[in-house]
């Protein structure tokens, strides 16, 4: 009778279904929706995340102006194709053969199309651009506070090592927090700065993706931090491909 | 990149033996723990053997024990599972996997494609 058997649940990924069946009675998790082996050390990839949540019952500032190419996921849910590693398939396709291709967060970033539609790989989003509006407090949260806060939550709570957080930018109510990492950045072992954004995103949300832990408790030199809007804009290494008629929509 | 290539699988009457290798490459083979884990038609996947890096300490699921052997040669890249006594229920696509274990938990982060045992008489 081991630890494992006691506590056999994954610390950071509640949307599985664990087991003391690996060796030596160890604790062994799978996701739902795939029942793809997962690593409860780490974040899991969004990917299987997405898959496991559809298959459970259910001008001079210092703030950045998100390029002309970067993308908003506009397109809501669906139930990903991941790969045998847990990342997106670069092309994802509905029950009605509608196939469109994703980057490496699983966002489009084509026109639509049907089961003839290619997409060569899959490109990687190497900036993220994470911009949150919080409610009114009594003043301005300090700059330098607010940066040390948001960056200690990347790397304690989504163990996003800090060289990724590129910057924390604020002007009231506005907070831009900017994630980058290209492929050849990021090592074997290093979170990706899309999962990190996704547990990010699901934990303002009051969705927390942790297991058994509280929801997010942001504070400020004690004063709580509450969000009221989140917008991510996701940047590809390789511009998307849309048409003008999307484009002038 | 991480490639895992298995061979040996077939046919075999109960009672038969077989024995799988696991041909590894893209990765530091001689650090790494490995696994043979099974999916039986219409069923999950199931851990069946586990061998730590260098070879000193193997686990094995219920159902094997006692019939089942793995081992590893280190010069060689390979992962090998010596298969004995086979009965019908041993029927699946046998896949190697690169592994890791904690204290308290296991888990596989790269499988072969896998090849395919049919216990049958």
């Known amino acids: 009778h081991t630890a494992a058997q006691d506590n056999c649940t994954c610390p950071t990924n509640k949307m599985t279904v664990c087991s003391p069946d690996g060796p030596g009675g160890r604790c062994q998790c799978r996701a739902l929706g795939s029942g793809m082996a997962v690593d409860c050390s780490t974040l899991t990839s969004k990917c299987l995340l997405l898959k496991a949540r559809m298959s459970a019952p259910k001008n001079a500032r210092t703030l950045v102006r998100p390029s002309e190419h970067a993308l908003v996921d506009n397109d809501g849910l669906y139930d990903p194709d991941c790969d045998p590693e847990g990342r997106f398939k670069a092309r994802q396709c509905n029950q009605t053969s509608v196939c469109w291709c994703v980057n490496s967060v699983g966002v489009r970033r084509t026109d639509k199309g049907d089961l003839s539609l290619r997409c060569d790989e899959l490109v990687r989003t190497h900036h993220i651009l994470i911009d949150l509006r919080h409610r009114p407090t009594a003043g301005a949260f300090n700059h330098s506070d607010l940066d040390a806060e948001l960056r200690r939550l990347f790397r304690e709570r989504y163990r996003l090592h800090p060289k990724f957080v590129a910057a924390v930018h604020y002007e009231q109510p506005t907070i831009q927090i900017e994630l980058r990492q290209n492929t050849s950045q990021k090592a074997a072992g290093d979170v990706d700065i899309g999962d990190a954004a996704y547990y990010f995103e699901r934990d303002i949300k009051g969705e927390s993706l942790f297991q058994g832990r509280g929801g997010l408790d942001l504070r400020v030199r004690g004063e709580p931090l509450q969000v009221e809007r989140t917008l991510i804009y996701y940047l590809d290494e390789i511009p998307p491909k849309f048409s003008m008629k999307r484009l002038t929509a | 990149q991480v490639q895992l290539q298995e061979s040996g699988g077939g046919l075999v009457q109960p009672g038969g033996s077989l024995r799988l290798s696991c041909a590894a490459s893209?990765?530091?083979?001689?650090?790494?723990?490995m696994s043979w884990v099974r999916q039986a038609p219409g069923k999950g996947p199931e851990w069946v053997s586990y061998?730590?890096?260098?070879?000193?300490?193997?686990y094995y699921a219920d159902t094997v024990k006692g019939r089942f052997t793995i081992s590893r040669d280190n010069s060689k890249n390979t992962l090998y599972l010596q298969m004995n006594s086979l009965r019908a229920e041993d029927t699946a696509v046998y896949r190697c996997?690169?592994?890791?274990?904690?204290?308290?938990?296991?888990?596989?982060?790269?499988w072969g494609q896998g090849t395919m045992v049919t216990v049958s008489s």
């Open positions: 996997a690169r592994a890791k274990l904690t204290d308290t938990h296991y888990v596989e982060d790269y």
């Open positions: 893209g990765f530091p083979f001689s650090s790494a723990d």
């Open positions: 061998i730590n890096a260098d070879g000193s300490k193997t």
